[in-house]
């Protein structure tokens, strides 16, 4: 058993049928010695008397808010949560496996640049009685500071018969140098509590590996005289690290017909312009990627050919 | 990326072209190592990230773009001094800092070159003959060093008398390649920045 926060405790259980569970001793936070009784949740049934209460915690029915009273007055509370260990592996019931970029990916994180700011998100099908708390650091043995905000519900989607909820959090490394070469990964730890179930999820990454630039901005077409060709030009996204000559991007320019089946023409360039043939009803899209470290491509910025 | 790329003309700055070749070569070598050594811990998540140049060179600090010198977090240690003559500087007036930066890059390359050559000698003794260092990568390191053209003491190749532990050698190769790729990215960024200045 360990303390999650004041008056909230997590009991770790080896979870299998007929398991013996864990013996837990609760102590009433009071100078009083006599006439103390204990109850669980809203029930008025007295579970025991005295300054301490010993219970055998086996299942969720044994978890909850234990309260000690004296003469009708509440003295203190202890909330017991359960953390299930199933065959040596902590349970992951609360969050959905996003399966990207690999199986068992519960937390996904992205950064728009090298400033040390990043966003993480996760999915669940649970809509109520759910709380999250997020901590982060650079490295684990001698951790350096990363400050995270509160996790917020950022999107709701319908997936088949189920509703899916996306939560996200923004974090900022306290003293980040965009040009630094990372040798210690960022660690992100999410505590999830659903009703009386506790779970924790972690992710470890280098900022360089989670970079995904914003799409190029100011995408424009300039027709070339007496030709079907157009000059496409764009700019670096505002959110990208500066100076751009140091934090350079490379670009992919794509001409896509109206039908998805039509052949796509693609050009790769390090410049912020390209000359392409604009077909009728086609659209031109441009996306960006760090020129020197191949992390994710940005989403496409698009303009119609007409 | 094995894709068609419209590359800018290196023009005035010959080191830019060499540094791009270096990054391509080390990235290819790392990819080859990850595939060949699939049963070894060779991915970024599995290895310890060690920098063999730590406390010996200060490339990131010495080569910091002017715009980032205002960032407190980037100014840890900018006091190392190096030899200051190099042919990449030939056609332009260069500041002391730029010379310091390029000589730091040269020292990095020299240290990695020695490590890789020592390691290759060990790998050639492996009866499994599982992996060797790409000669192209070693040649590209050499070319960039020549382009930088700093006079510096030659570092003797390390030789070891004990029987090599090939498992450890292959893990060390992965660690070295990961670190060298990160340094090659920094070198490319620096060359691109200097080329634009």
């Amino acid at each position: 058993i360990w303390e999650l926060k004041k008056d909230v405790y997590v009991v770790e259980l080896d979870w299998y049928p007929d398991a013996p569970g864990e013996m837990v001793v609760l102590t009433c936070d009071t100078p009083e010695e006599d006439g103390i009784t204990w109850t669980l949740d809203q029930s008025s049934e007295v579970l025991g008397s005295g300054k301490t209460l010993t219970i055998q915690v086996k299942e969720f029915g044994d978890a909850g808010q234990y309260t000690c009273h004296k003469g009708g007055e509440v003295l203190s509370h202890s909330l017991l949560l359960l953390h299930k260990k199933e065959d040596g592996i902590w349970s992951t019931d609360i969050l959905k496996d996003q399966k990207e970029p690999k199986n068992k990916t519960f937390l996904r994180c992205e950064a728009k640049n090298y400033s040390g700011r990043f966003t993480c998100w996760w999915l669940t099908t649970i809509s109520t009685d759910l709380t999250f708390s997020v901590k982060s650091s650079r490295g684990s043995s001698d951790p350096q500071g990363v400050t995270c905000g509160a996790a917020t519900l950022s999107a709701e989607r319908v997936r088949g018969d189920n509703k899916e909820y996306e939560y996200s959090v923004e974090c900022q490394e306290d003293s980040a140098c965009p040009a630094a070469e990372e040798s210690l990964p960022i660690e992100v730890m999410v505590d999830a509590v659903h009703k009386l179930k506790y779970e924790n999820y972690t992710s470890s990454f280098f900022i360089r590996d989670i970079i995904k630039p914003d799409p190029p901005k100011n995408l424009q077409l300039k027709p070339l005289k007496n030709s079907r060709q157009v000059e496409v030009s764009w700019e670096y996204p505002d959110t990208w690290s500066t100076p751009h000559s140091y934090f350079s991007l490379t670009f992919c320019v794509q001409v896509q017909g109206k039908s998805k089946r039509e052949k796509k023409d693609r050009v790769f360039t390090d410049k912020t312009s390209a000359t392409v043939i604009c077909r009728k009803n086609a659209s031109i899209s441009v996306r960006a990627q760090d020129r020197y470290y191949s992390s994710s491509w940005s989403e496409w910025a698009s303009v119609p050919c007409s | 990326r094995n894709l068609p790329v419209a590359t800018p003309d290196p023009g005035m700055f010959p080191c830019l072209h060499h540094s791009q070749n270096l990054l391509r070569a080390v990235s290819n070598m790392l990819q080859k190592a990850r595939q060949t050594l699939e049963f070894y811990p060779c991915t970024s998540e599995e290895i310890d990230h060690e920098d063999i140049t730590k406390d010996k060179t200060s490339t990131v600090e010495a080569c910091l773009p002017l715009e980032l010198t205002k960032n407190e977090s980037c100014l840890n240690s900018r006091e190392t001094s190096f030899i200051t003559n190099g042919s990449c500087l030939a056609s332009r007036k260069t500041s002391f800092m730029m010379a310091l930066c390029l000589s730091s890059i040269y020292e990095d390359l020299k240290m990695y070159q020695v490590e890789f050559k020592t390691m290759n000698a060990k790998l050639l003794m492996d009866p499994k003959r599982q992996i060797f260092l790409d000669q192209n990568m070693l040649a590209v390191i050499d070319e960039l060093m020549q382009a930088l053209n700093f006079n510096s003491e030659t570092v003797p190749q390390k030789s070891s008398l004990e029987e090599p532990d090939f498992y450890k050698t292959k893990i060390k190769l992965c660690i070295l390649l990961h670190a060298f790729r990160i340094r090659a990215v920094t070198i490319d960024r620096v060359m691109s920045y200097l080329n634009a200045s």
């Epitope: 979870w15 299998y16 049928p17 199933e86 065959d87 019931d93 690999k102 | -």
Partner: antibody, heavy 115, light 112 residues
Framework: QVQLVQSGGGVVQPGRSLRLSCAAS????????MHWVRQAPGKGLEWVAF????????YYADSVKGRFTISRDNSKNTLYLQMKSLRAEDTAVYYC????????WGQGTMVTVSS | SYVLTQPPSVSGTPGQRVTISCSGG????????VKWYQQLPGTAPKLLIY???TRPSGVPDRFSGSKSGTSASLAITGVQAEDEADYYC????????????FGTGTKVTVLG
């Protein structure tokens, strides 16, 4: 004490269907994940499928994906394995088992796929 | 498609020490715990060892398990006639959990 009693095995022709059942007692069935494991005659153990305690997630071996469906009825304390498009290579003793560091196995039920 | 490899058979005379190896990789045994089962002819498997080296109550102390890196082993010290059975190791793969990974199985024969 924990008990898993299996039923539904038998002889079936290739291409036909069969449903196996596993009745649980002696524990809170709705709190635990469950597996199906099979063993072809004279061969080793092969995992078939898993279902979460609440039925929300199901996992299958590649060899049965798209043909077998694992399900559970927590109100009846019963686990099921619906097997469709059966093949000769599905011939095996099928076991249900609880998920956890200490596990409990059913007695096994024989499924023979033969024409 | 077994990824946990065991020797097909091992044998010993009563009282001898018999060991069975189970060889895997970084993503399975290297990252997860190992179980060992005993299966007597015509019966369901019986758990002998969980969590690499822990015996459930009721399992004789002549059975012991260990794990090192990407391999595990089961030792029977002072093998007895009633130990003649098939033995299976089991673990998980970190990418496909909760799918069970079983070893190829080892037939233990007690001679004499």
């Amino acid at each position: 004490q924990v008990q898993l009693v299996q039923s539904g095995g038998g002889v079936v022709q290739p291409g036909r269907s069969l449903r196996l059942s596993c009745a649980a007692s002696g524990f809170t069935f709705s709190s635990y994940g469950m597996h199906w494991v099979r063993q072809a005659p004279g061969k080793g153990l092969e995992w078939v499928a898993f279902i979460r305690y609440d039925g929300s997630n199901k996992y299958y071996a590649d060899s049965v994906k798209g043909r077998f469906t694992i399900s559970r009825d927590n109100s009846k304390n019963t686990l099921y394995l619906q097997m469709k498009s059966l093949r000769a290579e599905d011939t095996a003793v099928y076991y249900c088992k609880t998920h956890g560091s200490h596990d409990n196995w059913g007695q096994g039920t024989m499924v023979t796929v033969s024409s | 498609s077994y990824v946990l490899t065991q020797p097909p058979s091992v044998s010993g005379t009563p009282g001898q020490r018999v060991t069975i190896s189970c060889s895997g990789g970084r993503s399975n045994i290297g990252s997860n715990t190992v179980k060992w089962y005993q299966q007597l002819p015509g019966t369901a498997p019986k758990l002998l060892i969980y969590g690499n080296d822990t015996r459930p109550s009721g399992v004789p102390d002549r059975f012991s398990g260990s794990k090192s890196g990407t391999s595990a082993s089961l030792a029977i010290t002072g093998v007895q006639a009633e130990d003649e059975a098939d033995y299976y190791c089991q673990s998980y793969d970190r990418g496909t959990h909760p799918a069970l990974l079983f070893g190829t199985g080892t037939k233990v024969t007690v001679l004499g």
